[in-house]
Interface confidence: medium
Amino acid sequence: VCSRDFTPPTVKILQSSCDGGGHFPPTIQLLCLVSGYTPGTINITWLEDGQVMDVDLSTASTTQEGELASTQSELTLSQKHWLSDRTYTCQVTYQGHTFEDSTKKCADSNPRGVSAYLSRPSPFDLFIRKSPTITCLVVDLAPSKGTVNLTWSRASGKPVNHSTRKEEKQRNGTLTVTSTLPVGTRDWIEGETYQCRVTHPHLPRALMRSTTKTSGPRAAPEVYAFATPEWPGSRDKRTLACLIQNFMPEDISVQWLHNEVQLPDARHSTTQPRKTKGSGFFVFSRLEVTRAEWEQKDEFICRAVHEAASPSQTVQRAVSVNPGK
Amino acid sequence: VCSRDFTPPTVKILQSSCDGGGHFPPTIQLLCLVSGYTPGTINITWLEDGQVMDVDLSTASTTQEGELASTQSELTLSQKHWLSDRTYTCQVTYQGHTFEDSTKKCADSNPRGVSAYLSRPSPFDLFIRKSPTITCLVVDLAPSKGTVNLTWSRASGKPVNHSTRKEEKQRNGTLTVTSTLPVGTRDWIEGETYQCRVTHPHLPRALMRSTTKTSGPRAAPEVYAFATPEWPGSRDKRTLACLIQNFMPEDISVQWLHNEVQLPDARHSTTQPRKTKGSGFFVFSRLEVTRAEWEQKDEFICRAVHEAASPSQTVQRAVSVNPGK
């Protein structure tokens, strides 16, 4: 604590600015303004990353305004040193006390590669399970103390449901954050727009993403299913293929069923929708089945869930490994 | 030109600095130092993106040192305004002349997301055309005066062939640069490593990418071809599907042939290789054919070119629209 008989200095660093194009000048001046102190001996030291700098400081002479004094000290740095993300400290010793201010190059305000995506509900969740959800996904965040906030809203201004959040550290060291929001089936079908707002201390500004039901023409999918013939060396395994095509819009869910039971999604591999030569989309789905399965019941069903399919938004096709038997 | 009887001012903007962690303060002060002029009336105006600002400037009173005067004017901005990349100008009118300095937030010194990719030769170019090429692709570059340099080298130190370069402006305003290098078939098969080095003034450092023949186990592809049955409303069109699976490594070329002629790649759509449940990969390829084609000759061939296929690195399967006829 400072004793009563002197006014301590305020220490503030100013810096030379970038030009009107945002370019750094070849040299950067740091100006340490030490102001408003009772006249007396002061000592100014500059530190670079906490280490005392051996520099010719070009300290300006002290000026006095009324009963208080001000001093300024200028440090000139090469652009290289400034862009090296070093921290510079102006340290002032006065009346046995230390006062300081530190600065470094401002962090990039548009951090590399942070991206946000907002999905639409899957047709399966929307039409079969009747519990649609949408997911806001934020990828490539650098882990830091600051929290990523994902907030939901509706264009209609109506309240949103409670969302669930998940954070995952990726192998490349980045953070992936997802927030999943349940939406009303009717709200979605009637065209409500949902917004996800992403804020984070390191983001220059909030990222806004919105989603709503796809507009435009509708077309139901055509579904075709095929079984591969036996291949030498794999008698106990076959591959089933399903081609689903000419549907619009591109939102589709694909499932495989055996014995009236839906197989887990992990069992099959389905491609992302791609455009056909016409105006629709297509996907392929691939399922590996075992002899035990086809001997138990040799009928497998490929089912597409799509808003334009009727009745009940589904189209399916059965396929057998040995159709003639 | 200034007349001889006065010394014009120097105008320089200083700004408040970021803290020792590189974080922007909640408000940013711009300090316009107008110095070294013969005492006289001066007028200071601040502009934002060229528009006069309606602000309370808190201009400090003029000080005089010897025969010359100095004035300073301070502008306080919200962090939002500063981070939105606007240009601020301190404009000084003196003796009928205008003097100014401009500034804006310094450009990010580590620009976001430039990526480089280096492809392997397609099996078709390698084994059928016998003129393999590799392509170095640089995406998400901000267009600027600086040139992107892509330089090729070989791990063996042997010379490289002449490469061809292409630049393309994307719709999102970024630049895509590709460089294609012909490589020797034998060099590639024998395991030569090729390097692409990408340099650009805005890149924090050179990007190095290297490519060589994939190592690991080999497995030839299984090829299956299917035709879709007639679908209501599309009597004159059919879709052919080709499933190519269980191959290793993942490099594969897929072609369709009709009447012993290879159809243009644009005619078919082939998925990217995906992993099977086992250790291999699979792709699907889709081809739309017309009645005119199948009535001319009802045999279509799906051909896979892959290094593990024998003989001559190809496996093919024929399919007909009306197999029974």
Partner: antibody, heavy 121, light 111 residues
Framework: EVQLVESGGGLVQPGGSLRLSCAVS?????????WEWIRQAPGKGLEWVAS???????NYNPSVKGRITISRDDSKNTFYLQMNSLRAEDTAVYYC??????????????WGQGTLVTVSS | DIQLTQSPSSLSASVGDRVTITCRAS??????????MNWYQQKPGKAPKLLIE???YLRSGVPSRFSGSGSGTDFTLTISSLQPEDFATYYC?????????FGQGTKVEIK
């Protein structure tokens, strides 16, 4: 002033494991910079081993990749080098350092005093 | 990897002598006009100390008798007038490309 202090060195048998620590004082490892391990075999030159960036990304010298893992504990302001399957040629003084960077190029500005690791049966 | 070769590997000199150490890189360490070459000093039982950055920039606090020069593949560290405290081993280091590598060192001994 920033200071780095290594610990955890000692005698270990070939095939064994060891975890070195580098305690940082005077600066938060989450604030910036890249944090490094560099080693020096007895009477030999210096070899960069591994680094961890303030954003958690890691880099390894290909000569040690797979046997060595760099990690950090922000709450302790400490970073670590986990060494497995140790060999006689891993015998060295291990230094931790703080790197300053310029456009992604790092140089080793502040060093610890070093800790000796001896791999011998 | 970029290999660095220093010469000589050792030298004997007297106080007041001018000493020159060279470092040759197996490929250029220049990038956009900057040379990514650094020089370190190491005394027995101590950690290395950074003397010079970017080929020729003297680190803050390093005496001005030390200087660095060169570009591309050839670099030089010069001590204009050797002082007793300068007897040590000097290493060059490139930070142009991963993995960063050091020269094998040059030991400066008292004649």
């Amino acid at each position: 002033e920033v200071q780095l202090v290594e610990s955890g060195g000692g005698l270990v048998q070939p095939g064994g494991s060891l975890r070195l620590s580098c305690a940082v004082s005077g600066y938060s490892i989450t604030s910036g910079h890249r944090w490094e391990w560099i080693r020096q075999a007895p009477g030999k030159g210096l070899e960069w081993v591994a680094s961890i960036h303030y954003d958690h990304s890691t880099n390894y010298n290909p000569s040690v990749k797979g046997r060595i893992t760099i990690s950090r504990d922000d709450s302790k302001n400490t970073f670590y080098l986990q060494m497995n399957s140790l060999r006689a040629e891993d015998t060295a003084v291990y230094y931790c350092a703080r790197a300053t960077h310029y456009f992604g190029h790092h140089h080793f500005a502040v060093w610890g005093q070093g800790t000796l690791v001896t791999v011998s049966s | 990897d970029i290999q660095l070769t220093q010469s000589p590997s050792s030298l004997s000199a007297s106080v007041g002598d001018r000493v020159t150490i060279t470092c040759r890189a197996s490929q250029s360490v220049d990038y956009h006009g900057d040379s990514y070459m650094n020089w370190y000093q190491q005394k027995p039982g101590k950690a290395p100390k950074l003397l010079i950055e970017w080929g020729s920039y003297l680190r803050s606090g390093v005496p001005s008798r030390f200087s660095g020069s060169g570009s591309g593949t050839d670099f030089t560290l010069t001590i204009s007038s050797l002082q007793p405290e300068d007897f040590a081993t000097y290493y060059c280091q490139q930070n142009a490309e991963d993995p960063y590598t050091f020269g094998q060192g040059t030991k400066v001994e008292i004649k």
